[in-house]
């Protein structure tokens, strides 16, 4: 049994780190493999993560952790029974992938404006809470040529779009993702998308 692609891990800077890797052939990850992790810290214990399959040869493991601080460093050991397949280390603060924003809602009852709101995925006491900026993707299933990214570089998780910039009488979808500039993170996954119908019509005089 061999590791084809070594584990690569990202932290949500809260309580979970996710490690993914590829094996040399089809593997029942949960039955055959264990990923052991231990914080390099006085009197810490070894903890065990049971991986799940992620495609035929891929495995994924969700490591439960305490809150992340910059000094944290973990040793990682990938075992197949008594055989050590791979040994490595992981510093969560240097490999951050934020949680995806949630509760994306579209408010169309505001005059001439489509208001999108969503929730910051972190509690106020988390360091990422005040560092997130967002990208909102809006597209139309009726008009495949239409897809826009709106960068939200302010803290408030809202975006206002003039309804007049969207075609009337068709449906749109939106989704949002986040990243934290000062923590040099990757982008989060996209939030689930939400759909709305743009019924806005310009006043008669402006037609």
């Amino acid at each position: 049994m061999k590791v084809l692609q070594e584990p690569a891990c990202v932290s949500d800077y809260m309580s979970i780190s996710t490690c993914e890797w590829k094996m040399g052939g089809p593997t029942n990850c949960s039955a055959e493999l264990r990923l052991l992790y231990q914080l390099v810290f006085q009197s810490s214990e070894t903890h065990t993560c049971v991986p799940e399959n992620n495609g035929g040869v891929g495995c994924v493991c969700h490591l439960l952790m305490d809150d992340v601080v910059s000094m944290d460093n973990y040793t990682l050991d990938l075992w197949a029974g008594q055989q050590l397949l791979w040994k490595g280390s992981f510093k969560p603060s240097e490999h951050v992938k934020p949680r995806a924003p949630g509760n994306l809602t579209v408010h169309t009852n505001v005059s001439d404006t489509v208001l999108l709101t969503w929730s910051n995925p972190y509690p106020p006491d988390n360091y990422l809470y005040n560092d997130l900026t967002y990208a909102v993707n809006i597209w139309s299933e009726n008009d495949p040529a239409y897809s826009r990214i709106h960068n939200v570089t302010y803290l408030k998780p809202t975006l206002r779009i003039p309804a007049s910039t969207l075609k009337s009488g068709i449906s749109y979808r939106a989704r949002v993702r986040a990243w934290a500039q000062h923590y040099n993170t990757t982008w989060s996954e996209w939030s689930p998308s939400t759909k709305w119908y743009n019924s806005y019509r310009e006043p008669f005089e402006q037609r």
């Epitope: 810290f41 006085q42 009197s43 810490s44 214990e45 070894t46 439960l64 305490d66």
Partner: antibody, heavy 125, light 112 residues
Framework: EVQLVESGGGLEQPGGSLRLSCAGS????????MTWVRQAPGKGLEWVSS????????YYADSVKGRFTISRDNSKNTLYLQMNSLRAEDTAVYYC??????????????????WGQGTTVTVSS | DIVMTQSPLSLPVTPGEPASISCRSS???????????VDWYLQKSGQSPQLLIY???QRATGVPDRFSGSGSGTDFTLKISRVEAEDVGFYYC?????????FGQGTKLEIK
């Protein structure tokens, strides 16, 4: 009441062996790391050894490494210090102390908040 | 190893007066914001040590509020706002960030 009681001290010749025990009560023993600290006559405190709650991680002072072994039996709520190849400079009062909560991924520290009454080890010919 | 250096080594104090003991570590014992792995212990004559302060500034359960700890990184202080006769003994600082845990030499507090 949270309590630690040491036993096993005594007089031993240089090169001899002793096993100290520390019985814990009043707390979930297996959840906490434990530590041994000693104090030579008229001297200050010296850390000797520590062990994590599950026993998977052990640590030793250079002065005892290779001679002393720390262990624990969580089913008996008891901590041990096996002392081999004893030297005159090992003469001291040995204390066991309750250390950090080590069941969490990052152990939580509240100081060495409970100490035993101490057991005296004398190494002399 | 982290070396802990205490001063003064002897501290005669008049009852009711404040007292202060300093402890310096040879390298930082700060792990994360607000978490300095330095403790203060008092050992009274013929007794086991007792915890006063942990993580630099956290008062242990049952410790009178006249005892306080402060400092960060490498410089720490134990203050007693008003010394009482029962406070006599040896005071030790200790770092527990990493093994080997190391103690200061001890400060003998005595009543004038």
């Amino acid at each position: 009441e949270v309590q630690l009681v040491e036993s096993g001290g005594g007089l031993e010749q240089p090169g001899g062996s002793l096993r100290l025990s520390c019985a814990g009560s009043g707390f979930t023993f297996r959840d906490f790391a434990m530590t041994w600290v000693r104090q030579a006559p008229g001297k200050g405190l010296e850390w000797v050894s520590s062990i994590s709650g599950g026993g998977g991680s052990t640590y030793y002072a250079d002065s005892v490494k290779g001679r002393f072994t720390i262990s624990r039996d969580n089913s008996k709520n008891t901590l041990y210090l096996q002392m081999n190849s004893l030297r005159a400079e090992d003469t001291a009062v040995y204390y066991c102390a309750k250390d950090r909560l080590s069941v969490t991924v990052r152990p939580r520290y509240y100081g060495l908040d409970v100490w035993g009454q101490g057991t005296t080890v004398t190494v002399s010919s | 190893d982290i070396v802990m250096t205490q001063s003064p080594l002897s501290l005669p104090v008049t009852p009711g007066e404040p007292a202060s003991i300093s402890c310096r570590s040879s390298q930082s014992v700060l792990y994360s914001i607000g978490k300095n792995y330095v403790d203060w212990y008092l050992q009274k004559s013929g007794q086991s040590p007792q915890l006063l302060i942990y993580l630099g500034s956290q008062r242990a359960t049952g410790v009178p509020d006249r005892f306080s700890g402060s400092g960060s990184g490498t410089d720490f202080t134990l203050k007693i706002s008003r010394v009482e006769a029962e406070d006599v003994g040896f005071y030790y600082c200790m770092q527990s960030l990493t093994s080997p845990y190391t103690f200061g030499q001890g400060t003998k507090l005595e009543i004038k």
